[in-house]
């Protein structure tokens, strides 16, 4: 099943997020992703856990998953590089780099996103954008067009409360508010963008969505700058 949803969001402005990628398995949306270099898409490692026998591709330049759009193009994946420390049973190090079969054709609707290299926390209360094609309500309706939501970053101490994520949020993770508006299982791999810079990637651990006591969890890309650089080199 697709790993992803934006709950309580709204339809995104078409092609205003030219870095947005749909990671697809056998032609169907599986996870979000973000174009970080001409030939590389960053996503979540857990997205490919069940994809061993399937064909993984990356869709760029899309707003609608089904409708023809001049900017849309599906790329094969030359190489999938999960973070070496990612494991099926934890949310830690949940990053995946996908090398496209060729450099993406860049344009107004396809453009890499600058990613944060300064290893510092986003200040609590800062509003950040998360987007994806995951289901939009608890009944499981899947959107055809890209959805987004602007969420405030939550401080780690609150996120780590026993009633929330009970100490699971390491310094390499961050949280955002989840009160009825949330990213969830299948926006996994998608970008959390603050002021035009990629700060986080939606983790793909299973958790309840839209419950304010279970904030959204995101992998801090700045904490993995050395690994990203080493793979992209």
């Amino acid at each position: 099943p697709p790993r992803g949803r934006i709950l309580g969001g709204r339809e995104a402005e078409a092609h205003a997020r030219p870095y947005m990628a749909s990671v697809q398995l056998n032609g169907a949306h599986l996870c979000g992703g973000v174009l970080v270099a001409e030939q590389w898409v960053l996503s979540a490692a857990h997205c490919l856990e069940d994809a061993a026998d399937g064909k993984v591709q990356v869709l760029l330049g899309a707003h609608s998953l089904s409708q023809p759009e001049p900017s849309k193009r599906l790329y094969d994946v030359l190489r999938a590089v999960p973070h070496p420390d990612s494991q099926p049973d934890t949310i830690d190090h949940d990053l995946l780099l996908l090398q496209l079969s060729e450099k993406a054709t860049l344009g107004p609707a396809v453009r890499p996103l600058p990613w944060q290299r300064v290893d510092r926390d986003v200040a609590p209360g800062t509003l950040c954008d998360v987007a994806g094609w995951g289901i939009v309500n608890h009944a499981g309706r899947r959107p055809d067009s890209l959805q987004h939501v602007l969420l405030p970053v939550l401080d780690r101490a609150t996120c780590n409360r026993r009633t929330h994520h009970d100490g699971a949020i390491t310094e390499r993770l961050m949280c955002a508010e989840s009160n009825r508006r949330d990213s969830c299982k299948g926006d996994s791999g998608g970008p959390l963008v603050c002021g035009g810079v990629l700060e986080g990637v939606v983790t793909s651990g299973s958790r309840v969505c839209g419950n304010r006591k279970k904030p959204g969890i995101y992998t801090r890309v700045a904490s993995y700058a050395a690994w990203i650089d080493s793979v992209l080199a």
């Epitope: 209360g125 800062t126 987007a131 602007l150 009160n179």
Partner: antibody, heavy 122, light 107 residues
Framework: QVQLQQSGPELVKPGASVKISCKAS????????INWVKQRPGQGPEWIGW????????YSNEKFEVKATLTVDESSSTAYMLLSSLTSEDSAVYFC???????????????WGQGTSVTVSS | DIQMTQSPASLSVSVGETVTITCRAS??????LAWFQQKQGKSPRLLVY???NLPDGVPSRFSGSGSGTQYSLKINILQSEDFGSYYC?????????FGGGTKLEIK
């Protein structure tokens, strides 16, 4: 044209409460954060907090957490701010403002109400 | 809380001149900054978002620049309608504080 129409001026006694309204029109009310801002004569504005009408989530400046209560009525596309235990320090013009989206992740207060003057005097 | 310090507090200039107003944050705000213009008795008007970007309808004589803790608003060839007060505001964490303002007066 997006508009935020605020309620009229208020003259209230110390210790009393006052509820200011802000009626939004020409956009989807539940899609945008509504912010409240205080401005005393000759001073810079002060951010009080925001409310997101789609979820009733609020986020307040600690300085105003006890003073101001933010609510919305989705059916009438109206935001409210209740100011309680008023003192002379609360005499000011209060603005509501919409947090607009620009591009993918940029935002700023793009549309403002005309302001509501609150005077606290015995 | 992040403090926003604007300078100068007031400025007396003539129509046609170019002016620069500065805003200093007490810590890095990573370009999460807006500028507003406010006329006496009116609501603030958004001029710049994300430090450098102009919303639709704002004349190109206005420009924003800066990064880290230092930001500027430049007004090229001042027009009579540009007189009033100018405020910066940050959006990095909360509370979203404003600067104390710069009052632009006609010489």
């Amino acid at each position: 044209q997006v508009q935020l129409q605020q309620s009229g001026p208020e003259l209230v006694k110390p210790g009393a409460s006052v509820k200011i309204s802000c009626k939004a029109s020409a956009y989807t009310f539940t899609d945008y954060y509504i912010n409240w801002v205080k401005q005393r004569p000759g001073q810079g504005p002060e951010w009080i907090g925001w409310i997101f009408p789609g979820s009733n989530s609020t986020y307040s400046n600690e300085k105003f957490e006890v003073k101001a209560t933010l609510t919305v009525d989705e059916s009438s596309s109206t935001a409210y701010m209740l100011l309680s235990s008023l003192t002379s320090e609360d005499s000011a013009v209060y603005f509501c403002a919409r947090l607009g989206y620009f591009g993918s992740s940029y935002h700023a207060l793009d549309y403002w109400g005309q302001g509501t003057s609150v005077t606290v005097s015995s | 809380d992040i403090q926003m310090t604007q300078s100068p507090a007031s400025l007396s200039v003539s129509v046609g001149e170019t002016v620069t107003i500065t805003c200093r944050a007490s810590e890095n705000i990573y370009s999460h900054l807006a500028w507003f213009q406010q006329k006496q008795g009116k609501s603030p008007r958004l001029l710049v978002y994300s430090a450098t970007n102009l919303p639709d309808g704002v004349p190109s004589r206005f420009s924003g620049s800066g990064s880290g803790t230092q930001y500027s608003l430049k007004i090229n060839i001042l027009q009579s309608e540009d007189f009033g007060s100018y405020y910066c505001q940050h959006f990095w964490g909360t509370p979203w504080t404003f600067g104390g303002g710069t009052k632009l007066e006609i010489k």
